[in-house]
Interface confidence: low
């Protein structure tokens, strides 16, 4: 189903504002009608246009060359260019064959302003829209061009062809038609208004500047379809593929017609399966069939005649070569010639597009760009070359700092970095309690080598990972004072290092006398247990970087703070010790700030108060 | 055909403004998807600058990204291109054109320059430092 926006952007698509109505009357217009677009005959033939399980539909693009003229490489489409609507939206059905698809209602049409050229090049192609949910709309994509030049004359026939585009085929046909008052087979002749005296006889129409010149018009069977129908006798009515009935009227695939060939049926009105002449396309090197009373014609490119068009008369006067290549051969008419093409075109005129990116050139992960006059590669960091074959040394003269060694890996260079360090070249202070190491809600306190786990009741371990009693008893030993058991805000550390903490306490002490004092709660630092003496004992600094908790006293109202903001208020905590365990609780009265590096914004850690020599830190 | 008139170019000092106009006339029986413009600086490759759809939406080649704003006016059958903070990189014929997108308005920048269905004849920019 196609959503309401997209219907919008079809019915804008359909009127561009900035292409407006004619404001003088063209010569004529070219038309073009597709008869079926599908997968050729043989094998390898593509099963649907439509990728798996996503709807599309198909629209068309010809856009019109003179013939004569030497085309550039990047030329626009001299005579005109249309696109047409798009066609009812297919959907694949798996395991059906493969159908030809359905395809958008009515002609293209190109307007001309001059002379109809009578030879003239064309190039058509067919566009998949797919509808899935991609970002920014539908995706479109090229499925075949065809190309090809022919002769043509205003006012004639429709004529038919054949063209195969890889496993594609497109079978359509053709006419250009004069815009009254023009007339002729280039429509360069102006027809005087009916009502001027005239000296024709009766049914005929009167022409400047040749006043003695008239012209029978050519008139089809009344009623004759105008779409569907044509005629090249008067009061005749022959019907384009597809379609059937005396005026052309009915479309062949709503009746239960088994070939859109021979005579009509009397009984059904349907058409009794024949062999068409122009089936198979007789006509060869790209000529157009058009069936005739009696047979078929050929209406041949430029330098081919006979028959079927099977004999080449080209020569590189006849600028048989497109998109800008170059004609190779003699001027005479019996001498072959060869198209050299340009980069990013193909086949025995030039008249295919190649995807070069489909090649994929690039190595080791490039992006490739098809400029047009050459490709190019985009490469991955740590390759270089013309298709990023080189594979560059990305350590050679980069160091890492702080200890840091480089690691070359997928060509790209980085750096392991010792531990408390990282980003590109280890020169920013890493935090080691990011990854959020000590389980069973224990609490990560980063150390300049490492960190340590201070561990919630029952657990123990490195990083937390051992229950204290496997069989479920309870491990917690009394609180302290004033701190009650059963206090979520509590955290127990290992005795051990509950010991070491002690034994460092001093030191500590000593040690953080010296940090300046500073009031400002945004910059929070230290916090002190409530009437304890100023500065007895420190927090363990930056502790608490990885855990929700409940900010205020246990017994207070209090507020959620998350320890993973980075620029909130950094609380932190006060122990209180007591053999063989620490306990844990925060004050909200800040004091010291944390300290800082020399850069804006990037905190450093604070020595931990006891020595590291003691410690093991994993 | 449809035919493609630009104006507006001239010589101006780096930093400067222009605002480029293409009037398009002529006559389409179908539509086309995008109008736009690209540029040609002598012994340079051709490059897409700006391409607008018929939705508006709009895309910029990176050198251009936030100084050109392109627009159209459909009532006046005009697609603009203003042209702000110039540099003197941005020396160049500066060319309307008209045509099928191919894949989306950010491609039609590329479609342009390969194919366009229609073009104009264009209008010197120079930018002098």
């Known amino acids: 189903m196609v959503s309401p926006r997209m219907s919008g952007l079809l019915s804008q698509t359909v009127i561009l504002a900035l292409i407006f109505l004619p404001q003088t009357r063209p010569a004529g217009v070219f038309e073009l009608q597709i008869h079926s677009f599908g997968p050729g005959p043989g094998p390898g033939a593509p099963r649907s246009p439509c990728s798996a399980r996503l709807p599309c539909r198909l629209f068309f693009r010809v856009c019109l060359k003179p013939g004569l003229s030497e085309e550039a490489a990047e030329s626009p489409c001299a005579l005109g260019a249309a696109l047409s609507a798009r066609g009812p939206v297919y959907t694949e059905q798996p395991g059906a064959p493969a159908p030809d698809l359905p395809l958008p209602d009515g002609l293209l049409q190109v307007p001309f302003r001059d002379a109809w050229p009578g030879t003239f090049s064309f190039i058509i192609e067919t566009w998949r829209e797919e509808l899935g949910d991609q970002i920014g709309g539908p995706a479109w994509s090229l499925l075949a061009r065809v190309a090809g030049r022919r002769r043509l004359a205003a006012g004639g026939p429709w004529a038919r062809d054949i063209q195969r585009a890889g496993a594609w085929e497109l079978r359509f046909s053709y006419r250009a038609r004069c815009e009254p008052p023009a007339v002729g087979t280039a429509c360069t002749r102006l027809c005087r208004p009916r009502s001027a005296p005239s000296r024709c006889g009766p049914g005929l129409r009167p022409c400047a500047p040749l006043e003695d010149e008239c012209e029978a018009p050519l008139v089809c069977r009344a009623g004759c379809s105008p779409e569907h129908g044509f005629c090249e006798q008067p009061g005749e009515c022959r019907c384009l593929e597809g379609w059937t009935g005396p005026l052309c009227t009915v479309p062949v695939s709503t009746s239960s017609c088994l070939s859109p060939r021979g005579p009509s049926s009397a009984t059904t009105g349907c058409l009794v399966p024949g062999p068409g002449p122009c089936d198979g396309n007789p006509c060869a090197n790209g000529g157009s069939c058009s069936e005739t009373p009696r047979s078929f014609e050929c209406t041949c490119p430029r330098g081919f005649y006979g028959l079927r068009c099977e004999v080449s008369g080209v020569t590189c006067a006849d600028g048989p070569c497109f998109n800008g290549g170059l004609c190779v051969g003699g001027a005479d008419p019996d001498s072959a010639y060869i198209c050299h093409c340009p980069p990013g075109f193909q086949g025995s005129n030039c008249e295919k597009r190649v995807d070069r990116c489909s090649l994929q050139p690039c190595r080791n992960g490039g992006l490739c760009l098809d400029l047009g006059h050459a490709l190019r590669c985009r490469c991955r960091a740590g390759f270089a070359g013309p298709r990023c074959e080189h594979d560059l040394d990305d350590c050679a003269g980069r160091a890492c700092a702080n200890g840091g060694t480089c690691v070359e890996g997928g060509g790209a260079h980085r750096c392991s970095c010792a531990l408390g360090f990282g980003g590109r070249d280890c020169r920013e202070r890493a935090d080691p309690c990011a990854a959020r190491p000590c389980a069973h809600g224990g609490r990560c306190y980063a150390h300049f080598s490492g960190l340590v786990c201070a561990c919630a009741p029952g657990y123990m371990g490195a990083r937390c990972e051992f229950p204290v009693h496997p069989d479920g008893a309870s491990a917690l030993p009394a609180a302290p004072p004033g701190l009650r058991p059963g206090d979520p805000q509590r955290y127990l550390l290992p005795p051990a290092l509950g010991l070491l903490v002690a034994a460092g306490v001093a030191g500590a002490a000593l040690l953080l006398v010296h940090v300046r004092r500073r009031g400002h709660s945004q910059d929070a630092g230290s916090r002190l247990l409530a009437g304890t003496p100023e500065p007895s004992v420190h927090a363990l600094p930056d502790a608490l970087n990885n855990l929700r908790t409940q900010e205020g006293s246990g017994d207070g109202p209090s507020s959620s703070v998350d320890w993973n903001r980075p620029e909130d208020v950094d609380p932190q905590g006060i122990y209180v010790i007591s053999a063989p365990s620490i306990y844990a609780r925060e004050v909200a009265t800040p004091l010291f700030p944390p300290l800082h590096t020399g850069r804006a914004g990037q905190r450093q850690h604070l020595l931990f108060p006891y020595p590291s020599s003691i410690l093991s830190v994993k | 055909q449809v035919r493609l008139v630009e104006s507006g170019g001239g010589s101006v000092q780096a930093g400067g403004s222009l605002r480029l106009s293409c009037v398009a006339s002529?006559?389409?029986?179908?539509?086309?998807?995008?109008m736009g413009w690209f540029r040609q600086a002598p012994g340079k490759e051709r490059e897409g600058v700006a391409a607008i759809d018929t939705d508006g939406r709009t895309s910029y080649a990176d050198s251009v990204k936030g100084r050109f704003t392109i627009s159209k006016d459909n009532a006046k059958n005009t697609l603009y291109l203003q042209m702000n903070s110039l540099k003197p990189e941005d020396t160049a014929m500066y060319y309307c054109?008209?045509?099928?997108?191919?894949?989306?308005?950010?491609?039609?920048?590329?479609?342009?320059?390969?194919?366009?269905?229609?073009w104009g004849q264009g209008t010197q920019v120079t930018v002098s430092s």
């Open positions: 002529g006559y389409f029986y179908n539509t086309y998807y995008f």
């Open positions: 054109a008209a045509g099928f997108g191919y894949m989306n308005v950010i491609q039609a920048l590329n479609g342009m320059r390969q194919n366009p269905d229609y």
